[in-house]
């Protein structure tokens, strides 16, 4: 056999020594090269001459090492799915889209398709943090001791319940999961009808 | 020893239909990618087709490109070339043919070749 | 397509003779040429391939050469088992194309 170090190449397993760059080509029985991101092939490779890649053209994009003899088109983010741009398309990348504040990713196909409204956590509770934002709905979790939330809300996070003391108040009623601490006046009594955090 | 067997050859006329056979012996069918050549009255040897070992990939030169269609059958050994649409320029001997397997794709065996005559 | 100009079409040569055929390709094939020999009501047999390589069983009197566009099939001592047509053929970019033959003729 001939052993040549750069494609076109003779193969007899149908196998390429680097499989993310080459490719094997049946019908000439050999490895060629693929075209880089951001190109496709302009003309197919033979035994006598390898794969002609051109550049794709505006608005197209190839995002991985390809064979492909078309680039793919630059596609919008669809705001009726629910979807934003966080960046643009280039030759080599695909436009890229999250889902807008406030939803999460409900149908998923190699990449978010389909964008819905967050569901909303209950007073009391809040939602617990995700690595990524967007990936999935709201899973509401009980504010830990010391804490409150007071609102229906997807995003409202739990908060520390005031520390009377620290405005030289005294405590009138204790912060539940739900409320806030009730703070007054050392010197003068809460009337029982009145439900403000503080009284000043 | 190598052998191969052409079959199915005859007159046909203009529009008409054949299918050609090749019978393979004396070496491991399934190893090799399979070719029918044809050669015209007046001597002048075209490619017609070509078949992977496997039989997944098929080509073919665009004068025959959508009329013919080869196929293989590795279990008994044979080779097949269904042609239809045909035209006297079709009219040829056509010869199954083996390429050998190693690196250099030269064509190693031929048949002894079927007569395909189109004619009204 | 890479069209095979194979010259000359026709000749006659005595016995014992040096005999040169040649082919030339209309791009660079890279070697990727192969020399087939056809007896009258046979069919075509190897002779050489990858331009300069005997194939088995083939007299030693056979040989081949060439590279780029330009190549040769040469018998050094012609013998009357010779007369036959010769072809070229490229496989080194579909579709496969053949040279018009050389009938070859003992005088």
């Known amino acids: 056999s001939q052993p040549q170090a750069v494609p076109p190449y003779a193969s007899e397993n149908q196998t390429c020594r680097d499989q993310e760059k080459e490719y094997y080509e049946p019908q000439h029985r050999i490895c060629c090269s693929r075209c880089p991101p951001g190109t496709y092939v302009s003309a197919k490779c033979s035994r006598i001459r390898d794969t002609v890649c051109a550049t794709c053209a505006e608005n197209s994009y190839n995002e991985h090492w390809n064979y492909l003899t078309i680039c793919q088109l630059c596609r919008p983010c669809d705001p009726v799915m629910g979807l934003e741009e966080i960046a643009p398309c280039t030759s080599k990348r695909k436009t890229q889209c999250r889902c807008q504040p406030g939803m999460f990713c409900a149908a998923w196909a190699l990449e978010c398709t389909h964008c819905e409204l967050l569901s909303d956590c209950p007073p009391g509770t809040e939602a617990e943090l995700k690595d990524e934002v967007g990936k999935g709905n709201n899973h509401c979790v009980p504010c830990k001791a010391g804490h409150f939330q007071n609102t229906s809300s997807p995003s409202a996070r739990c908060q520390p319940h005031t520390r009377c003391e620290n405005q030289g108040l005294v405590e009138a009623a204790p912060g539940t999961a739900q409320s806030d601490t009730t703070c007054k006046n050392p010197l003068e009594p809460l009337p029982p009808e009145m439900s403000g955090t503080m009284l000043m | 020893e190598v052998q191969l067997v052409e079959s199915g050859g005859g007159l046909v006329k203009p529009g008409g239909s054949l299918k050609l056979s090749c019978a393979a012996s004396?070496?491991?069918?399934?190893?090799?990618?399979m070719y029918w050549f044809r050669q015209t009255p007046e001597k002048r040897l075209e490619w017609v087709a070509t078949?992977?070992?496997?039989?997944?990939?098929?080509y073919y030169p665009d004068s025959v490109k959508g009329r013919f269609t080869i196929s293989r059958d590795n279990a008994k050994n044979n080779l097949y070339l269904q042609m239809s649409s045909l035209k006297s320029e079709d009219t040829a001997m056509y010869y199954c043919?083996?390429?050998?397997?190693?690196?250099?794709?030269?064509?190693?065996?031929w048949g002894q070749g079927t007569t395909v005559t189109v004619s009204s | 397509d890479i069209k095979m100009t194979q010259s000359p079409s026709s000749m006659y040569a005595s016995l014992g003779e040096r005999v040169t055929i040649t082919c030339k390709a209309g791009?660079?094939?890279?070697?990727?040429l192969s020399w087939y020999q056809q007896k009258p009501w046979k069919s075509p047999k190897i002779l050489i391939y990858?331009?300069?390589r005997l194939a088995d069983g083939v007299p030693s009197r056979f040989s081949g050469s060439g590279s780029g566009q330009d190549y040769s099939l040469t018998i050094s001592s012609l013998e009357s088992d010779d007369t036959a047509t010769y072809y070229c053929?490229?496989?080194?970019?579909?579709?496969?194309?053949f040279g018009g033959g050389t009938k070859l003729e003992i005088k």
């Open positions: 043919v083996r390429e050998e397997n190693g690196n250099f794709y030269y064509f190693d065996y």
């Open positions: 791009q660079d094939i890279k070697s990727y």
């Open positions: 053929l490229q496989h080194g970019e579909s579709p496969w194309t």
């Open positions: 078949i992977s070992d496997g039989g997944s990939y098929t």
């Open positions: 990858y331009a300069t």
């Open positions: 004396g070496f491991t069918f399934s190893d090799y990618y």
